[in-house]
C-alpha cells in the first residue's frame, strides 16, 4: 500500500530538513565555541547528570506520553525526537545570540545545553495539541517559530523587568500550553465520520503513554531544579516537586475512580494527572518552605487535572472548536496558571513575613511577566497556526488525522493495526 503522504512533500521534506541542518552546522561553525574554562571532573559529571535527566524527560517522557493513539504511536515518538533534536540546536544558537549584547561568539556549556533542552521541551508540550494533525514539515516550522517566540518572550521580559534572561524560562509551562492551544485552534476542525477509529486509544499505546508519564514522574524534580543555583533552593525544589508528585499520583488514581460511574480507573486520566503536582509547583518549588504545602498543591493539582480531563476536552471541542488535544496538554494550561498564581501568593507571604516593603512591586512584576508570557504565547501561536494552514505544507487531510500509515513504511500491514 503506497503512502498517502503527498508526493511533493515526501520529495522535498528530506531535502529541506537536510538543508536546514546544513545551515545550522554553518551557524555553529561560525558563531560557536566550547567553554574553555576549567571544571572539576566530579562537577562536570554532576552537571551532566541534570542535563541527562532533562533529555530523558524530553525524549522518552514526552515522546511516549503523546503515543496514546492506536494508529499514531510511531509518529508521536519519532516526531517528538525529531523536534527535540532540531529544537535543541536552534535554541542553543538563539539563546546565545539573545543573551549577550553586543552579540559575540556563543559559548557552549553544559548549562547552555540544559537551557536549550528546556526550550525544546516547550515545543514538545505544545506539540501535544497538534500531533496527528500536522506533518513533519509543519512541525519543523513550529519548532523554529516557537523556540524563537520563547526566546523573544524571555528577551522582552529581561529588558522590561530587568530579570536575568535565562531565569525567565520559569514561564515555559504556561507559554507552551497556550501556544499549543492557539495553534490547534487554527488547524482544520471537523473530524469526519469514520476517523474516530484513529482517535481511539488502545491498550498498548495507553501503556506506552503511561511509560512516558512514569519517565516524566521520575525526572520531574530535575526539571524544576535545573536552573537554580543555590543548593538550598535546589534541594527545596527537588523535595517539593517529589512530594507534590507523590500526592498527585494518589489523587489521580482515587480521583479517576471517583469520576467514573462504575468506580473504574481511566488510564487516560491517570497518566495525565500523575504529573499534575510537578507542573503546579514548577514556578514556586524553591519558595515552598515545607512539604505539607507542596502536598496540598499536589492534591489540588490532581483534583483539577481529573476534573479537567473530564471537562476540558469537551469544552475545547464545543467552545473553542479544538478537536482532540491531549488531556495532558489541556491540563498544562490550567496547572501552569495554578503554578504562577501560587508563586505570586508565596511571594506576597514571603515579603510580608520578612517585612519587605517591595511587596506591591514584586507582585506587579510577577503579574506583568505572566501576562506578557500569555500574550506572546497567544500571538505567536496564532501566527504559527495561520502559517501552518498555508497550502505549501500539504497538511494531512482531516480524514488522515492520527494515522501512521500516512508517514511510515510498514513491513507488513496486519489487519488489526
Amino acid at each position: 500500500m503506497s503512502s498517502k503522504y503527498p508526493r511533493s512533500v515526501r520529495r522535498c521534506l528530506p531535502l529541506c530538513a537536510l538543508t536546514l541542518e546544513a545551515a545550522l552546522i554553518l551557524l555553529f561553525y561560525f558563531f560557536t565555541h566550547y567553554d574553555a574554562s576549567l571544571e572539576d571532573q566530579k562537577g562536570l559529571v554532576a552537571s551532566y547528570q541534570v542535563g541527562q535527566d532533562l533529555t530523558v524527560m524530553a525524549a522518552l517522557g514526552l515522546g511516549f506520553l503523546t503515543s496514546n493513539f492506536r494508529r499514531h504511536s510511531w509518529s508521536s515518538v519519532a516526531f517528538n525526537l525529531f523536534m527535540l533534536a532540531l529544537g535543541v540546536q536552534w535554541a542553543i544558537l538563539l539563546d546565545g545570540f539573545l543573551s549577550q549584547f553586543p552579540p559575540g561568539k556563543v559559548v557552549i556549556t553544559l548549562f547552555s545545553i540544559r537551557l536549550a533542552t528546556m526550550s525544546a521541551m516547550s515545543v514538545l508540550i505544545s506539540a501535544g495539541a497538534v500531533l496527528g494533525k500536522v506533518n513533519l514539515a509543519q512541525l519543523v516550522v513550529m519548532v523554529l517559530v516557537e523556540v524563537t517566540a520563547l526566546g523573544t518572550l524571555r528577551m522582552v521580559i529581561s529588558n522590561i523587568f530587568n530579570t536575568d534572561y535565562h531565569m525567565n524560562l520559569r514561564h515555559f509551562y504556561v507559554f507552551a500550553a497556550y501556544f499549543g492551544l492557539t495553534v490547534a485552534w487554527c488547524l482544520p476542525k471537523p473530524l469526519p465520520k469514520g476517523t474516530e477509529d484513529n482517535d481511539q486509544r488502545a491498550t498498548i499505546p495507553s501503556l506506552s503513554a503511561m511509560l512516558g508519564a512514569l519517565f516524566l514522574w521520575m525526572f520531574w524534580p530535575s526539571v524544576n531544579s535545573a536552573l537554580l543555583r543555590s543548593p538550598i533552593q535546589r534541594k527545596n525544589a527537588m523535595f517539593n516537586t517529589y512530594y507534590a508528585l507523590a500526592v498527585s499520583v494518589v489523587t489521580a488514581i482515587s480521583g479517576s475512580s471517583l469520576a467514573h460511574p462504575q468506580r473504574k480507573i481511566s488510564m487516560t486520566y491517570v497518566h495525565s494527572a500523575v504529573l499534575a503536582g510537578g507542573v503546579a509547583v514548577g514556578t514556586s518549588c524553591h519558595l515552598i518552605p515545607s512539604p505539607w504545602l507542596a502536598m496540598v498543591l499536589g492534591l489540588v493539582a490532581g483534583l483539577i487535572s481529573i476534573g479537567g480531563a473530564k471537562c476540558l476536552p469537551v469544552c475545547c471541542n464545543r467552545v473553542l472548536g479544538i478537536h482532540h488535544i491531549s488531556v495532558m496538554h489541556s491540563i498544562f494550561s490550567l496547572l501552569g496558571l495554578l503554578g504562577e498564581i501560587t508563586y505570586i501568593v508565596l511571594l506576597v507571604l514571603h515579603t510580608v513575613w520578612n517585612g519587605n516593603g517591595m511587596i506591591g512591586f514584586q507582585v506587579l512584576l510577577s503579574i506583568g511577566e505572566l501576562s506578557l508570557a500569555i500574550v506572546i504565547a497567544l500571538t505567536s501561536g496564532l501566527l504559527t497556526g495561520l502559517l501552518l494552514n498555508l497550502k505549501i505544507w500539504k497538511a494531512p487531510h482531516v480524514a488522515k488525522y492520527f494515522d501512521d500509515q500516512v508517514f511510515w513504511k510498514f513491513p507488513h500491514l496486519a489487519v488489526g493495526f
Epitope: K42, F101, S230
Partner: antibody, heavy 128, light 107 residues
Framework: EVQLLESGPGLGKPSETLSLTCGVS????????WSWIRQSPGKGLEWIGE????????HYNPSLKGRVTISKDASKNQLSLRLTSVTAADTAVYYC?????????????????????WGRGLVVTVSS | ELQMTQSPSALSASVGDRVTISCRAS??????LAWYQQKPGKAPKLLIY???RLQSGIPSRFSASGAGTEFTLTISGLQPEDSAVYYC?????????FGPGTKLDIK
C-alpha cells in the same frame, strides 16, 4: 551565626604550592556556594573561584591560568584552596566567603548573589 | 571578560551628607550586582545584593539602584562609621569581577 576561619602557612617560596583551608562553623557547607577571594597589599579584591557545597561544581578565575584548585571536605565541614607555582604576585590576604541566598531573588545556576559571610583573612607572603 | 569601573575613586564628605557612588559594567549584567564596605584591616561586608536589595542588619541609610550596566550606591545621612572603601561586584557570569573601589572619607 556562621563563622569562617582561614588557616595555612603564612609564608611561601616562589614555585611552591600554596595550600589553605577554611573551617566553617554554624552552617553546613553543603547548603551554600563558597568562594575564595584575595586582596594584594594596597590593591582591590580579586575573585579566585568558587565551589558548590552540595556537588563538586567549581568555577575559577581564568587569570590564574589553571593554577588553582578548590575542594571541600563535607565530613570536616571545611574548604581548601590549592595554588601551584606561586610567585611574589600571589602575595595577598586570602579570604574565604559564603554566598548568601534569598528565595525571593533566586539566582540562575551561572549567576551568583552577594557574599554575605567572610572569614577574617589570612596574610600570605611569597618570597625567596 | 567583564570589566567593572567605579567613580569617583575617592571622595570626601561631611557627617549628615548624602553621597552617591557609581559603578558601571562593560556589558549587561541585569540586576546581578553586589555592594560591599571594607574598613582598614577588616574583611569586606555585604551591603546590597541583587542591585537594590538591602542585606539584613544593614542600616536603611544605605540604598542602591540600577540595572543593566549602570548602578549606584547611595548613603544618605552619612555617619562617621561609614568611612571605608566601597566595592561593587558583578555576579552575573564568573569570574565574578570586583570594581576597583571608592574610598570614602568623612571630614
Amino acid at each position: 551565626e556562621v563563622q569562617l576561619l582561614e588557616s595555612g602557612p603564612g609564608l611561601g617560596k616562589p614555585s611552591e604550592t600554596l595550600s589553605l583551608t577554611c573551617g566553617v562553623s554554624g552552617a553546613s557547607i553543603s547548603n551554600y556556594w563558597w568562594s575564595w577571594i584575595r586582596q594584594s597589599p594596597g590593591k582591590g579584591l580579586e575573585w579566585i573561584g568558587e565551589i558548590d557545597g552540595s556537588t563538586y561544581s567549581t568555577h575559577y578565575n581564568p587569570s590564574l591560568k589553571g593554577r588553582v584548585t578548590i575542594s571541600k571536605d563535607a565530613s570536616k565541614n571545611q574548604l581548601s584552596l590549592r595554588l601551584t607555582s606561586v610567585t611574589a604576585a600571589d602575595t595577598a590576604v586570602y579570604y574565604c566567603a559564603r554566598e548568601g541566598q534569598d528565595p525571593l531573588a533566586p539566582t540562575l545556576a551561572t549567576s551568583g548573589s552577594g557574599l554575605d559571610s567572610w572569614g577574617r583573612g589570612l596574610v600570605v607572603t611569597v618570597s625567596s | 571578560e567583564l570589566q567593572m569601573t567605579q567613580s569617583p575613586s575617592a571622595l570626601s564628605a561631611s557627617v549628615g551628607d548624602r553621597v552617591t557612588i557609581s559603578c558601571r559594567a562593560s556589558q549587561d549584567i541585569y540586576s546581578n550586582l553586589a555592594w560591599y564596605q571594607q574598613k582598614p584591616g577588616k574583611a569586606p561586608k555585604l551591603l546590597i545584593y541583587g542591585a537594590s536589595r538591602l542585606q539584613s542588619g544593614i542600616p536603611s541609610r544605605f540604598s542602591a539602584s540600577g540595572a543593566g550596566t549602570e548602578f549606584t550606591l547611595t548613603i544618605s545621612g552619612l555617619q562617621p562609621e561609614d568611612s571605608a572603601v566601597y566595592y561593587c561586584q558583578e555576579v552575573h557570569r564568573n569570574p565574578f569581577t570586583f570594581g576597583p573601589g571608592t574610598k570614602l572619607d568623612i571630614k
